[in-house]
Structures are given as C-alpha cells and as structure tokens.
C-alpha cells in the first residue's frame, strides 16, 4: 500500500490555498481531499527504503 497521510500545500490556483493538514490536492478535481483517498507515498520510518525516491516537497505541491 502506498497510501497514507501527507500534508501537502494546495494546488488550486491562480491563488493557491494550502490544504489543511491530512489533506492533499487532487489535481483531477482541483480541490483538497483526504490524503488517504489518493495514492500518495506513505511516510517511511527513518532508514527504511522508499519505493520511489521523492524530492523535497515544494510549496503548493
């Protein structure tokens, strides 16, 4: 499973509003939804290998 909570900033432009914690921006419907509804990477314990290396999250990502 690659689902799990991740606090992402909102993607609803032109003036992006941050999603609240535990919500993620759904690019396909253009609004914030519960992160568990999207297949986002589950944060791993320190030292655990990740299925895909992720760049640091950028603002509004």
């Amino acid at each position: 499973m690659r689902r799990g909570p991740r606090s992402l900033r909102g993607r609803d432009a032109p003036a992006p509003t941050p999603c609240v914690p535990a919500e993620c921006f759904d690019l396909l419907v253009a609004h914030c939804v519960a992160c568990g509804l999207l297949r986002t990477p589950r944060p791993k314990p320190a030292g655990a290998s990740s299925p895909a290396p992720r760049t640091a999250l950028q603002p509004q990502e």
Epitope: M1, D26, L27, L37, L38, R39, T55, Q60
Partner: antibody
C-alpha cells in the same frame, strides 16, 4: 507491491462489445485513480479514462459514448466496456494506477492484446 | 487536448553513444501551482511502459544516472549519456498538467544502428 492484471477475450467481432477486467492486488481501488490506456499498432498510446476513489468516471471524448468504466470494490477489480467495436479498436489494452503526488502512472498491468476481426 | 510532439520517431544509435529525444507540447506544461508535470516512460519489447523520469528531471527509483531529463515550458529533452543494450525500446513523453485527458507523445524507437 501493487500489481495489476488485465483479463478478457483476445478476439472480438466487429459491432460487438469489448469487455476487460483489471484485478488489483496490493492496494485498494477505493484509493486513487484507476485508468485504462491502449496502445495501437505503430506505438500510439491513447488515454481512455479513469474510475476514481469515489467511483466517479472520466471518459476521453474521442471515445464518445462507447466507453464505460465500472468497478467492484468487494473484488478489488475495475472494468472496461467498449461498445460497437471496429477494427480500429485493435490494440493492446493496459490498466494503470496513478500516483497521487506527482501524477504519473506508477503501476501498469502487463497488457492484453485485443484483436477486432470477423 | 494537449498535443505532445516527439522527435525523432526512430533513433538508431551505436552502443555507448549519447542519445537525445525531444518532446514539445502544444501549451506550456507549467501548472498554476508552479509544477511541471512532464514525465518520460520506456516501453521495452514485450513489456508494459515503465516510468523513467517524473516532473521533467527526477529519476524514478532504480533508473540509472545515465538517464537525464531537462526542459521547461513547452520544450523538453531526454538524454541517455551512454546507450546500453537494455535501453532499447520505445520512449514516450507524457503530460499530467492539463488533465484529463492525460496525453502522450507519439513515441521514439531507440534501436541499434
């Protein structure tokens, strides 16, 4: 690991309905977007549509009203139906899962070749 | 829909050579959030497509560093610094900025010269 597997008939007659199943293991289809993509002879990839975590659907307008994507959450499967097929629908059909952070297709089925011929 | 134009359609190379594939989009792929959702996939013979590069320049897990992606706006490039036999196949660019529908380039077949 998430795995997807397409199944269904490899030969369909013109004017009939193409029906495929995508079986998902390692993740729940009640999370994310689950997609159908096809590849024509000659390498063209066409995005067909999705069914979402909520059960909402999107269909590529190029397929008009011929396409239907449904799901059975109890079986963790989703389905493609393409009505009134012609030889132009001969293609390899893939189901794929969508990463919800960077929005790429991170997991694909092996694909199934469907030939439309009488 | 966004049209993705890939060149060349066929790319004959010698092993060890550098290869370069271009992808151009009919509109800028910079999303209003500032991100550019341009990805590259490789489909090896008999396999399904596999992600190589996401968001223009980020290598996916397990992808060798001889693969690199660059570009911005509407013009993007995938480079392979030293082609190996296992790199042969069809390369596709794809955009997830203006979706749905997701759209793909026409594909570039990398083959041995």
């Amino acid at each position: 690991d998430v795995q997807l597997q397409e199944s269904g008939p490899s030969l369909v007659k013109p004017s009939q309905t193409l029906s495929l199943t995508c079986s998902v293991t390692g993740d729940s289809i009640t999370s994310g977007y689950w997609n159908w993509i096809r590849k024509f002879p000659g390498n063209k990839l066409e995005y067909m549509g999705y069914i979402s975590y909520s059960g909402s659907t999107y269909y590529n307008p190029s397929l008009k009203s011929r396409i239907s994507i449904t799901r059975d959450t109890s079986k963790n499967q989703f389905y493609l139906q393409l009505l009134s097929v012609t030889t132009e629908d001969t293609a390899t059909y893939y189901c794929a899962g969508l990463d919800g952070l960077y929005w790429y297709f991170d997991v694909w089925g092996a694909g199934t070749l469907v030939t439309v011929s009488s | 829909d966004i049209v993705m134009t890939q060149t060349p359609l066929s790319l004959p190379v010698s092993l060890g050579d550098q290869a370069s594939i271009s992808c151009r989009s009919s509109q800028s792929l910079v999303h209003s959030n500032g991100n550019t959702y341009l990805h590259w996939y490789l489909q090896k013979p008999g396999q399904s497509p596999k992600l190589l590069i996401y968001k223009v320049s980020n290598r996916f897990s397990g992808v060798p560093d001889r693969f690199s992606g660059s570009g911005s706006g509407t013009d993007f490039t995938l480079k392979i610094s030293r082609v190996e036999a296992e790199d042969l196949g069809v390369y596709f660019c794809s955009q997830s900025t203006h979706v749905p529908p997701f759209t793909f380039g026409s594909g570039t077949k990398l083959e041995i010269k």
